[in-house]
Interface confidence: low
Amino acid sequence: EEELQVIQPEKSVSVTAGESATLNCTVTSLIPVGPIQWFRGAGPGRELIYNLKEGHFPRVTTVLDPTKRNNMDFSIHISNITPADAGTYYCVKFRKGSPDVELKSGAGTELSVRAKPSAPVVSGPTARATPEHTVSFTCESHGFSPRDITLKWFKNGNELSDFQTNVDPAGKSVSYSIRSTARVVLTRRDVHSQVICEVAHVTLQGDPLRGTANLSEAIRVPPTLEVFQRPMRAENQVNVTCQVRKFYPQRLLLTWLENGNVSQTETASTLTENKDGTYNWRSWLLVNTCAHRDGVVLTCQVEHDGQPAVSKSHALEVSAHQKEQCSDTTSGPVLAPTAPLGGSG
């Protein structure tokens, strides 16, 4: 009598997560009588996948009817494959007994699960940085298999080269994760810029996944200040303007000081947006030129986005003509007693 053989023709089968897998197994003889069982893995810790004789296996069906006497095909169909199903599957013949006695195992079929990577998530720095500084962005994607994966970084469509990528774990696993950190040097024009992390994998059929982050969340463009004065129609008044230019983000607090003493504080409101995404703002004071005796220094002090204040000072210029318009009895505050004392626009 010919010795019974258990034949698993495929050494490996690869399927995409969510699909079904067919694992083939035939035996060369139906004698002796006894069940066929499928296991994942070998040795004492193996996991029972399908038992012809008993049990409930909702995701597993036999390809052919195993109850037919002349059927020597014990191939199975596993539906809705997940990465956790990866492993080596063995078709095993038992001889009926109490307990059943294992007679022969097939050589095993390695089931590899191709799982799509999750949508890449790009995270930026926790604190803003100023132009010319380097910031790091991290891209993570999980749950893919096989391990082979390609990750690229782009800034405004241009590929970046300064990044480091790791795929974990290093050894074999049912699924893998990728983490990449890119270093980006900020420029003043980066408020509207975007970084893109692009992940290509065999399961994506040439249509890579992308994750994005806006540099507007990572950049702080400090303002430039300019203080100047202009005459007004009323000959004893001048307009002193603080022009705050090219800053980002919007959060800005402006304080006017008269000879070092706080006279007025404003929060930036009606801002003008520049094409590059930065903002401009101006604040102005009406100054009574007759009220001063000695030189008056007006300082525009700006605290931007919680950073240390920057300031620009202006010595009030009063012409001889303006001085002539003031009577000897004039007295009072330097700032014109208008309400409000200052304005913005």
Partner: antibody, heavy 118, light 107 residues
Framework: EVQLVESGGGLVQPGGSLRLSCAAS????????MHWVRQATGKGLEWVSA???????YYTGSVKGRFTISRENAKNSLYLQMNSLRAADTAVYYC????????????WGQGTMVTVSS | DIQMTQSPSSLSASVGDRVTITCRAS??????LAWFQQKPGKAPKSLIY???SLHSGVPSKFSGSGSGTDFTLTISSLQPEDFATYYC?????????FGQGTKLEIK
């Protein structure tokens, strides 16, 4: 035919540098984890470094910071840049391909001899 | 690092003999164990992966077994071309490590 051919070995003084190359044919190198393994004369095999398909790199402790593994997909080639070489680095260096699913070594090059001596 | 210990370090046998080489890992490596054959002046040749799977073209007289920490390589009937040095290797985690080798010599 699947083949790996190493080159770039030779005699170098301690502290010197050498760059080993491994030309792959018959398969796409970037689709596999690739490794360097070395063997000092009369000694056993020692794993040195690996580069994964995503460009991730790994090194044995004794070469960390001195050796750099890289690959050039356009040339289907693997490299090992060896700096600050020591006498203990003297060995035959083999380029090895890892298996597609579990990284089990399957294809070996013929090896290239590196001698570090003054 | 995972240590791999082979025994014996050397072994004398005759043509036709059945020989077994053992390899022990310092921690569980599942079945991520490979066996290699090396002849003098030649590059190693891959024989077995995942403890028991034969590489393509490797004759069936070679067999591997084991899981966890203890593994064996068996050559069922030695032929003259089988006299060589055999190495085991774990590849479950970096750094990959080899056993010190077992030199199989003709008695």
């Amino acid at each position: 035919e699947v083949q790996l051919v190493e080159s770039g070995g030779g005699l170098v003084q301690p502290g010197g540098s050498l760059r080993l190359s491994c030309a792959a044919s018959g398969f796409t190198l970037s689709s596999y984890d690739m490794h360097w393994v070395r063997q000092a004369t009369g000694k056993g095999l020692e794993w040195v470094s690996a580069i994964g398909t995503a460009g991730d790199t790994y090194y044995t402790g004794s070469v960390k910071g001195r050796f750099t593994i890289s690959r050039e997909n356009a040339k289907n080639s693997l490299y090992l840049q060896m700096n600050s070489l020591r006498a203990a680095d003297t060995a035959v260096y083999y380029c090895v391909r890892g298996g597609v699913w579990d990284d089990a070594f399957d294809i070996w090059g013929q090896g290239t001899m590196v001698t570090v001596s003054s | 690092d995972i240590q791999m210990t082979q025994s014996p370090s050397s072994l004398s046998a005759s043509v036709g003999d059945r020989v077994t080489i053992t390899c022990r890992a310092s921690q569980d490596i599942n079945n991520y164990l490979a066996w290699f054959q090396q002849k003098p002046g030649k590059a190693p040749k891959s024989l077995i992966y995942t403890a028991s799977s034969l590489h393509s073209g490797v004759p069936s007289k070679f067999s591997g077994s084991g899981s966890g920490t203890d593994f064996t390589l068996t050559i069922s009937s030695l032929q003259p071309e089988d006299f060589a040095t055999y190495y085991c290797q774990q590849y479950v985690s970096y750094p990959y490590t080899f056993g010190q080798g077992t030199k199989l010599e003709i008695k």
